[in-house]
């Protein structure tokens, strides 16, 4: 039994880090493998993560971490029984993938303005809370070419757009994702999408 693709890990900078790797053949990850992780430098306990299968030869492990600070560094040991298959380390602050925003809502009752709001996925005491920026994706269910991205570079989790920038009388969907420049994070996953019917009063044209 060998590791074909070494574990790579990302942290949500809150409570979970996710590590994925591939074995050289079909593996029952949960019965055959264990990933041990332990904080370096400070007094701490070695914790065991039981991996799950992620495709035939792929494994994924969710490492529980009650909090994260920038200095944290973990040793990672991948075991198959008594055999050490791989040894490495992981610094969560250098591999951050934020949590996806939630509760995306489209408010269509503000004159001819669309107000999109969503929730910051972090509590106020988490460092990322005040450092997230967002991308909002809006697309038409009828027209695949009608696909747009709005970058929200301010901290407030909301976006206002004129309803007239979208076609009237058709359905649109929106979703949002987040990233944090301070830690050069990857983008989060997209939030679940929300759907609305776009309609607005066409301006009266005088001839």
């Amino acid at each position: 039994m060998k590791v074909l693709q070494e574990p790579t890990c990302v942290s949500d900078y809150m409570s979970i880090s996710t590590c994925e790797w591939k074995m050289n053949g079909p593996t029952n990850c949960s019965t055959e493998l264990r990933l041990l992780y332990q904080l370096v430098f400070l007094l701490s306990e070695a914790h065991t993560c039981i991996p799950e299968n992620n495709g035939g030869a792929g494994c994924v492990c969710h490492l529980l971490m009650d909090d994260v600070v920038s200095a944290d560094n973990y040793t990672l040991d991948l075991w198959a029984g008594q055999q050490l298959l791989w040894k490495g380390s992981f610094k969560p602050s250098e591999h951050v993938k934020p949590r996806a925003p939630g509760n995306l809502t489209v408010h269509t009752n503000v004159s001819d303005t669309l107000l999109l709001t969503w929730s910051n996925p972090y509590p106020p005491d988490n460092y990322l809370y005040n450092h997230l920026t967002y991308a909002v994706n809006i697309w038409s269910e009828n027209d695949p070419a009608d696909f747009r991205i709005y970058n929200v570079t301010y901290l407030e989790p909301s976006l206002r757009i004129a309803a007239s920038t979208l076609k009237s009388g058709i359905s649109y969907r929106a979703r949002v994702r987040a990233w944090a420049q301070c830690y050069n994070t990857t983008w989060s996953e997209w939030s679940p999408s929300t759907k609305w019917h776009n309609s607005y009063r066409e301006p009266f044209e005088q001839h």
Epitope: L42, L43, E45, A46, D67, V69, A71
Partner: antibody, heavy 118, light 106 residues
Framework: EVTLKESGPVLVKPTETLTLTCTVS????????VHWIRQPPGKALEWLGV???????DYNAAFKSRLTISKDNSKSQVVLTMTNMDPVDTATYYC????????????WGQGTTVTVSS | DIQMTQSPSSLSASVGDRVTITCRAS??????LAWYQQKPGKAPKLLIY???TLAEGVPSRFSGSGSGTDFTLTISSLQPEDFATYYC????????FGQGTKLEIK
């Protein structure tokens, strides 16, 4: 409600062995580590050692040769044994729960005062 | 072992005052520092960990800052129940505490 309570002798003679028990409730010893900390009268706190949720232990090097920490998960009890007691070991002894992955103490026992005297 | 030096060892203040207690580590401990409050005859109570994270149920008038070797605990507006002894603690092995700062009523 999370509680920890220390019990054991109030008075120990020099060279004797001290055995203290920490009985916990409101959480499982299979999920949390438990530390022992002591405080001599009028002095600062001093960390003695810890038994982790998995049963492994870490000790302050200054006490390692005469300190043993063990536990019985089913009884929710952690036991501290310190050999060759000396009058300088007179202190209030506390057990405390480890908070998550950080060795900080979010719940403490009320402490038990141990006097070492002949 | 890493030594923790607290200052001052004691201080007098009045209700409503802003108070700062400092803790210095003999070497870099990053942000691996906690603060505790202890009242006479009682067990210590966790106030802050990771240098600045407020423990559950601790009033927001308490705050912590610093990283590396220099740390501070600040009480923005002293309340009568805040008069106690305060300890810092780092969590590198072996764990050590500062010698304490006794906060008394002026």
């Amino acid at each position: 409600e999370v509680t920890l309570k220390e019990s054991g002798p109030v008075l120990v003679k020099p060279t004797e062995t001290l055995t203290l028990t920490c009985t916990v409730s409101g959480f499982s010893l299979t999920n949390y580590g438990v530390h022992w900390i002591r405080q001599p009268p009028g002095k600062a706190l001093e960390w003695l050692g810890v038994i982790w949720s998995g049963g492994s232990t870490d000790y302050n090097a200054a006490f390692k040769s005469r300190l043993t920490i063990s536990k019985d998960n089913s009884k929710s009890q952690v036991v501290l044994t310190m050999t060759n007691m000396d009058p300088v070991d007179t202190a209030t002894y506390y057990c405390a729960r480890n908070k998550g992955t950080r060795p900080v103490f979010d719940y403490w026992g009320q402490g038990t005062t141990v006097t070492v005297s002949s | 072992d890493i030594q923790m030096t607290q200052s001052p060892s004691s201080l007098s203040a009045s209700v409503g005052d802003r108070v700062t207690i400092t803790c210095r580590a003999s070497e870099n401990i990053y942000s691996y520092l906690a603060w505790y409050q202890q009242k006479p005859g009682k067990a210590p109570k966790l106030l802050i960990y990771n240098a600045k994270t407020l423990a559950e149920g601790v009033p927001s008038r308490f705050s912590g800052s610093g990283s590396g070797t220099d740390f501070t605990l600040t009480i923005s507006s002293l309340q009568p129940e805040d008069f106690a002894t305060y300890y810092c603690q780092h969590y590198v092995s072996p764990l050590t505490f500062g010698q304490g700062t006794k906060l008394e009523i002026k």
